[in-house]
């Protein structure tokens, strides 16, 4: 977890939010855990943040992430619909001015200090899976999801809709 007080003091005024010219429809703080109930934690190491997937000790506080939700249209020619389909997109920020960021070249998930407007790599399409789990698909690389690999977050290519429910790309959100 953060050695600094950043996350636990993160009941600050929500991000001022004119990201890509649109405002989030809602924002809230939640802890992020895997399908198998391991916690996603963030640590400051050598002046950069590392992301870990780990079991927390009994009374250890979970790190919180600010989730900002945006509506996005995908054009009817992409969705195959007669109408534009609305998708729910999310950005994830564990501490002020830092956002989860998809590095598609390295297949990695990183924390980057970003200026607004945020780059597309900071946006993920939210999918509800497995009733109360979610997954995060890269806006910049459809079919690629945030997943768990070797106790770290990584980008994982999902080849078919049957594999959308594989446990390593499923996450749980909790306000507690």
């Amino acid at each position: 977890a953060f050695g600094i007080s950043g996350v636990q003091k993160y009941t600050r005024a929500l991000h001022d939010s004119s990201i890509t010219g649109i405002s989030p429809i809602t924002e809230y703080l939640a802890s992020l855990s895997t399908y198998n109930d391991q916690s996603i934690t963030f640590a400051l190491e050598d002046e950069s943040y590392e992301i870990y997937v780990e079991d927390l000790k009994k009374d250890e506080k979970k790190d919180k992430v600010l989730l900002s939700y945006y509506e996005s249209q995908h054009p009817s020619n992409e969705s195959g619909d007669g109408v534009d389909g609305k998708m729910l997109m999310v950005t994830l920020s564990p501490t002020k001015d830092f956002w989860l960021h998809a590095n598609n070249k390295e297949h990695s998930v990183e924390l980057h200090k970003c200026e607004k407007p945020l780059p597309d790599q900071a946006f993920f399409v939210l999918h509800n899976m497995h009733s109360n789990c979610v997954s995060f698909e890269c806006k910049t690389d459809p079919g690629v999801f945030i997943g768990v690999k070797d106790n770290h977050l990584a980008l994982i290519k999902v080849d078919s809709s049957e594999n959308l429910c594989t446990e390593n790309i499923l996450f749980k959100l909790s306000e507690t």
Epitope: V83, G85, K86, L88, L126, H127, N128, S131, C165
Partner: antibody, heavy 122, light 107 residues
Framework: EVQLVESGGGLVQPGGSLRLSCAAS????????MSWVRQAPGKGLEWVAS????????YYADSVKGRFTMSRDNSKNTLYLQMNSLRAEDTAVYYC???????????????WGRGTLVTVSS | DIQMTQSPSSVSASVGDRVTITCRAS??????LAWYQQKPGKAPTLLIY???SLQTGVPSRFSGSGSGTDFTLTISSLQPEHFATYYC?????????FGGGTKVEIK
């Protein structure tokens, strides 16, 4: 324009079966989560079953689990609800409803069909 | 499952009145709450999603607020076409659950 049209309702005896259909136009059903919601005469809305746009499910309310089966035929852009072992308490108008968001149920249901009445009585 | 409790179950009001309907969730649902209007013999129609976002085509006389467990639907100036039953629905956790409904009647 999005349209959902249910059919297949009617009068059936207790223990009988019906298959409801929901034909969609203006959208590709497979891109969206879809649900069946029912409303007994003079009562409120009750969720019955769902299939997620992301491929999860189907999921069922406890009251219909083991008796109802939800499916969709992507080639026909049609949703189905096979209802077996029907009971008097299943009497209701059955609506199909579309998730507002492709892939997520967080936005509620933005399009509903007009409904089809199922009456279970001897 | 999350229980949704709506109040009042019915309200009598006159054209031009301000009407407020509340919805309480049995546990926190962040902001994922929807409001629907239903007229007799018709299907429900979505009014508000994400607690406060107005669905396209819905008049701005309707507004929603709240987060966590307590939510409100307000009709700022009741019009004749607004006499109907209103339902809240939580969309945060599966399965989706609805409030019992609030019937807005003519005084």
């Amino acid at each position: 324009e999005v349209q959902l049209v249910e059919s297949g309702g009617g009068l059936v005896q207790p223990g009988g079966s019906l298959r409801l259909s929901c034909a969609a136009s203006g959208i590709t059903l497979s891109s969206y989560g879809m649900s069946w919601v029912r409303q007994a005469p003079g009562k409120g809305l009750e969720w019955v079953a769902s299939i997620f746009g992301s491929g999860g499910g189907p999921y069922y309310a406890d009251s219909v689990k083991g008796r109802f089966t939800m499916s969709r035929d992507n080639s026909k852009n049609t949703l189905y609800l096979q209802m077996n072992s029907l009971r008097a308490e299943d009497t209701a108008v059955y609506y199909c409803a579309k998730d507002r968001y492709s892939g997520s149920y967080y936005g509620g249901f933005d399009y509903w069909g007009r409904g089809t009445l199922v009456t279970v009585s001897s | 499952d999350i229980q949704m409790t709506q109040s009042p179950s019915s309200v009598s009001a006159s054209v031009g009145d301000r009407v407020t309907i509340t919805c309480r969730a049995s546990q926190g649902i962040t902001s994922w709450l929807a409001w629907y209007q239903q007229k007799p013999g018709k299907a429900p129609t979505l009014l508000i999603y994400a607690a406060s976002s107005l669905q396209t085509g819905v008049p701005s006389r309707f507004s929603g607020s709240g987060s966590g467990t307590d939510f409100t639907l307000t009709i700022s100036s009741l019009q004749p076409e607004h006499f109907a039953t209103y339902y809240c629905q939580q969309a945060n956790s599966f399965p989706p659950t609805f409030g019992g409904g609030t019937k807005v009647e003519i005084k």
